[in-house]
Interface confidence: low
């Protein structure tokens, strides 16, 4: 029943072109090129895509035509290496072009930049956008794909096509509406926020595959799919995990055409076999392909089968535990993970993986002991503290969130994380802490049974952002250690960090705390970011400052901004009152 067994094709590019259709082929090639060459102008990418498309058509017409038998990596890599300004724009990335496949593609992948030096996307006026949309819909949508792909070089390509479809639908509907802005802006905000979340989730999948290997990804997938499809048999879950791993390996490896094609096949397989997978798939499977695949990926957990027997019988009490483990270690551990996960939709995936790791470590030790059964008899007791740790942490943080609200909860995390890893750049600390703080509004509203999977798995995604940003410019051994030692223990590792006593406080720089009238025209979110940036800088100057001291300074700062934004001569107010605020803050913090 393998979805992916295919006959060999004389021409891979013709095969994918026919499978996907011209529109999807062109969109995916554009995404692939923009994710590799993130600085190239839009027009250059469109030209390259058109050239590749024309070539693909010649191969469709005659699969034996010259170069049609070349691999997609060879064809796409050759095309990327024709860019005239490669050396000037990308520096050492140009050296990739001297390599042969598959090393050349690996080289391009290593040069993907998670934080490219690109201007922030500024949203034009609604009328301007609608005019552009009506004037040339195709170019407008291509530009969307290009701008997202170059800023998010690991964005899940078939999912980006789904976002583009929704983007198009929003403009189609709203540009005809009486109040275009009221219709369009909330939709664009929703797409932006969902897009950032989708990008971050996919980035974790790629990091998992690239940094920790296929086994780590498969373990994650077994746990998640077993929670989602608890009625499916282990063999069915294993088959889905194998196929899903192939899809994500392809997308993370830049093989976007294969990835999109295989994802479509997997959605088709799931829908054709939904009776043996989940009762929750019916609605998803009635949708068109892009919506169907998205819906399946987000589908709610099916109900657990009634009367599942105790896990202890097969995994602790049985005399065959060590025999079964020795025969096929990963299969036995996979079965353990499947059985545990389908019984515990209330646990986070990372907790389930910690439990499986503990079980594996215990069997490794005990199956070599004189009395294995005696040795592993109490293994489930070792799980208790592992389960209680995230439960307690979430309880405490949700109480804090409910007490403070999102903005102040973010500020508490900003202070906490700046004290843990003060060497990390201020923009990264602000971005990561703001996202960590969003866990409150995202997860604390849920009942107890849904809090942990929501919170801890979300935190894994956010901490991965910290890890990939830090990897580009490593500045903290503590961050490197937490990021690289264990994928599933990243969050406990960061939670356990105390104030970094080795940190030498940053020199005070008045310029960092100088503000201007432009702050008054910023959106509430952007104003918050300005204030949070100042807060991080304060902590970097005075890491031993108490909560009370920091709160007093931040309250003064908020009052200062409010006062000067109401003043007639705003700029003068910011200059004069700003000096007073800096002096008062220095005094309050003993700087």
């Amino acid at each position: 029943r393998g979805v992916f067994r295919r006959d060999a094709h004389k021409s891979e590019v013709a095969h994918r072109f026919k499978d996907l259709g011209e529109e999807n082929f062109k969109a995916l090639v554009l995404i692939a090129f923009a994710q590799y060459l993130q600085q190239c102008p839009f027009e250059d990418h469109v030209k390259l895509v058109n050239e590749v498309t024309e070539f693909a058509k010649t191969c469709v017409a005659d699969e034996s035509a010259e170069n049609c038998d070349k691999s997609l990596h060879t064809l796409f890599g050759d095309k990327l290496c024709t860019v005239a300004t490669l050396r000037e724009t990308y520096g050492e990335m140009a050296d990739c072009c001297a390599k042969q496949e598959p090393e050349r593609n690996e080289c391009f992948l290593q040069h993907k930049d998670d934080n490219p030096n690109l201007p922030r996307l500024v949203r034009p006026e609604v009328d301007v956008m609608c005019t552009a949309f009506h004037d040339n819909e195709e170019t407008f949508l291509k530009k969307y794909l290009y701008e997202i792909a170059r800023r998010h070089p690991y964005f899940y390509a078939p999912e980006l096509l789904f976002f583009a479809k929704r983007y198009k639908a929003a403009f189609t509907e709203c540009c005809q509406a009486a109040d275009k802005a009221a219709c369009l802006l909330p939709k664009l905000d929703e797409l932006r926020d969902e897009g950032k979340a989708s990008s971050a989730k996919q980035r974790l999948k790629c990091a998992s595959l690239q940094k920790f290997g296929e086994r780590a990804f498969k373990a994650w997938a077994v746990a998640r799919l077993s929670q989602r499809f608890p009625k499916a048999e282990f063999a069915e879950v294993s088959k889905l995990v194998t196929d899903l791993t192939k899809v994500h390996t392809e997308c993370c490896h830049g093989d976007l055409l294969e990835c999109a094609d295989d994802r479509a096949d997997l959605a088709k397989y799931i829908c054709e076999n939904q009776d043996s997978i989940s009762s929750k798939l019916k609605e998803c499977c009635e949708k068109p392909l892009l919506e169907k695949s998205h819906c399946i990926a987000e589908v709610e957990n099916d109900e657990m089968p009634a009367d599942l027997p105790s896990l202890a019988a097969d995994f602790v009490e049985s005399k065959d535990v060590c025999k079964n483990y020795a025969e096929a270690k990963d299969v036995f551990l996979g079965m353990f993970l499947y059985e545990y996960a389908r019984r515990h939709p209330d646990y986070s995936v990372v907790l389930l993986l910690r439990l499986a790791k503990t079980y594996e470590t215990t069997l490794e030790k005990c199956c070599a002991a004189a009395d294995p059964h005696e040795c592993y008899a109490k293994v489930f007791d070792e799980f208790k503290p592992l389960v209680e740790e995230p439960q307690n942490l979430i309880k405490q943080n949700c109480e804090l969130f409910e007490q403070l609200g999102e903005y102040k909860f973010q500020n508490a995390l900003l202070v906490r994380y700046t004290k843990k890893v003060p060497q990390v750049s201020t923009p990264t600390l602000v971005e990561v802490s703001r996202n960590l703080g969003k866990v409150g509004s995202k997860c604390c509203k849920h009942p107890e049974a849904k809090r942990m999977p929501c919170a801890e798995d979300y935190l894994s995604v956010v901490l991965n952002q910290l890890c990939v940003l830090h990897e580009k410019t490593p500045v903290s051994d503590r961050v490197t250690k937490c990021c690289t030692e264990s994928l599933v223990n990243r969050r406990p590792c960061f939670s356990a960090l105390e104030v970094d006593e080795t940190y030498v406080p940053k020199e005070f720089n008045a310029e960092t705390f100088t503000f201007h009238a432009d702050i008054c025209t910023l959106s509430e979110k952007e104003r918050q970011i300005k204030k949070q940036t100042a807060l991080v800088e304060l902590v970097k100057h005075k890491p031993k400052a108490t909560k009370e001291q920091l709160k007093a300074v931040m309250d003064d700062f908020a009052a200062f901004v409010e006062k000067c934004c109401k003043a007639d001569d705003k700029e003068t107010c910011f200059a004069e009152e700003g000096k007073k605020l800096v002096a008062a803050s220095q005094a309050a913090l003993g700087l």
């Epitope: 979805v3 026919k18 996907l20 479509a264």
Partner: nanobody, 127 residues
């Protein structure tokens, strides 16, 4: 609910031509996989041709390559099967099938399930 309606079948002498049509209604046709199947008496149903309606290029079974041409008209939500140089072994009931998948994979899922079927139209080729 997707509705598929075939037409254009009939009786013809060997070497003659027929043009089958399949009109689709009830779902967004722009990204569908459409196929023509046929079933001769006492034989298994076989896929003859398939096309992705978001693209241009059909796939054909070896037995009909060079004789049959499949095309689509998105404006009319209709696919066609132009059958030339007909042979007696082309006789059978011809069914139109649709699947809202991304593309048509004869290679990977020649025998894949199609969720939506027409009632069929009879083609008889006599020698």
């Amino acid at each position: 609910q997707v509705q598929l309606q075939e037409s254009g079948g009939g009786s013809v002498q060997a070497g003659g031509s027929l043009r089958l049509a399949c009109a689709a209604s009830g779902y967004t046709y722009s990204s569908a996989c459409m196929a023509w199947f046929r079933q001769a008496p006492g034989k298994e149903r076989e896929k003859v041709a398939t096309i992705y309606t978001g693209g241009t290029y059909p796939y054909y079974a070896d037995s009909v390559k060079g004789r049959f041409t499949m095309s689509h008209d998105n404006a009319k939500n209709t696919v066609y099967l132009q059958m030339n140089s007909l042979k007696p072994e082309d006789t059978g009931m011809y069914y139109c099938a649709a699947d809202a998948s991304w593309g048509c994979r004869l290679s990977g899922s020649w025998g894949a399930k199609y969720n939506n079927w027409g009632q069929g139209t009879q083609v008889t080729v006599s020698s």
